[in-house]
Amino acid sequence: DAEFRHDSGYEVHHQKLVFFAEDVGSNKGAIIGLMVGGVV
């Protein structure tokens, strides 16, 4: 599966939300929905 980035400091990776430290940066993309800052 693809990897999805979030503004709030976690990412969707292998279908799970995993915290990461660095700032995400760009939030360009489609709003996934029912998440925090999730775009793809």
Partner: antibody, heavy 121, light 111 residues
Framework: QVQLVQSGAEVKKPGASVKVSCKAS????????IHWVRQAPGQGLEWMGF????????NYNQKFKGRVTMTRDTSTSTVYMELSSLRSEDTAVYYC??????????????WGQGTLVTVSS | DIVMTQSPDSLAVSLGERATINCRAS??????????LNWYQQKPGQPPKLLIY???KQGTGVPDRFSGSGSGTDFTLTISSLQAEDVAVYYC?????????FGGGTKVEIK
């Protein structure tokens, strides 16, 4: 106003494929992912996956093991969900839906009217 | 995958009385102090409608009699004073991780 309008009911034979469409209007098509949720008769809700009209990237529920494909046509603001190798258990109403993220000042959901797919020999 | 379990399967409540529906997740649906737990109402022949998101926040246009509580793995939807138009099936859903998953539903009827 935001609208998601789905294609009409389908009757398919086991082993066949079905392609359901969801035409979006009333907002910028590429700004929201479109999700697909199905509901077998008298049963609960099951999330199938989503596709991004912006990037074309999709994320699928692995339960469908490669049988599902979600695509989009930005020229017509339409998303498609194709399900292959149909079996009787795939008989269901298929919904497309759009959701806001929860960090918005408001959260709304929009749903298509549903498409009944009947799989029968 | 996260499994969502609702109870009861159905309940009958008198008009004006309180209805309480429970939802349990097989693992925590919290992340960064947010519960990714949502509640939907579905009436016959209609698509679902989002009532509550992030466990406690009301969706747009949802009446104040609907409220949500809980965190981690245990959540509750409360209808404080049941109205005739509240007869429906209610579903919980987690959006913490993919695949999103729903509870089996709770049918609310008038006693």
């Amino acid at each position: 106003q935001v609208q998601l309008v789905q294609s009409g009911a389908e009757v398919k034979k086991p082993g066949a494929s079905v392609k359901v469409s969801c035409k979006a209007s009333g907002y910028t098509f590429t700004t929201y992912a479109i999700h697909w949720v199905r509901q077998a008769p008298g049963q609960g809700l099951e999330w199938m996956g989503f596709t991004s009209p912006y990037s074309g990237v999709s994320n699928y529920n692995q339960k469908f093991k490669g049988r599902v494909t979600m695509t989009r046509d930005t020229s017509t603001s339409t998303v498609y969900m194709e399900l292959s190798s149909l079996r009787s258990e795939d008989t269901a109403v298929y919904y497309c839906a759009r959701f806001d993220n929860i960090d918005r000042g408001y959260v709304r959901d929009y749903w298509g009217q549903g498409t009944l797919v009947t799989v029968s020999s | 995958d996260i499994v969502m379990t609702q109870s009861p399967d159905s309940l009958a409540v008198s008009l004006g009385e309180r209805a309480t529906i429970n939802c349990r997740a097989s693992e925590s649906v919290d992340n960064d102090r947010i519960s990714f737990l949502n509640w939907y109402q579905q009436k016959p022949g209609q698509p679902p409608k989002l009532l509550i998101y992030a466990a406690t926040k009301q969706g747009t246009g949802v009446p104040d009699r609907f409220s949500g509580s809980g965190s981690g793995t245990d959540f509750t939807l409360t209808i404080s004073s049941l109205q005739a138009e509240d007869v429906a099936v209610y579903y919980c859903q987690q959006s913490k991780e993919f695949p999103w998953s729903f509870g089996g539903g709770t049918k609310v009827e008038i006693k």
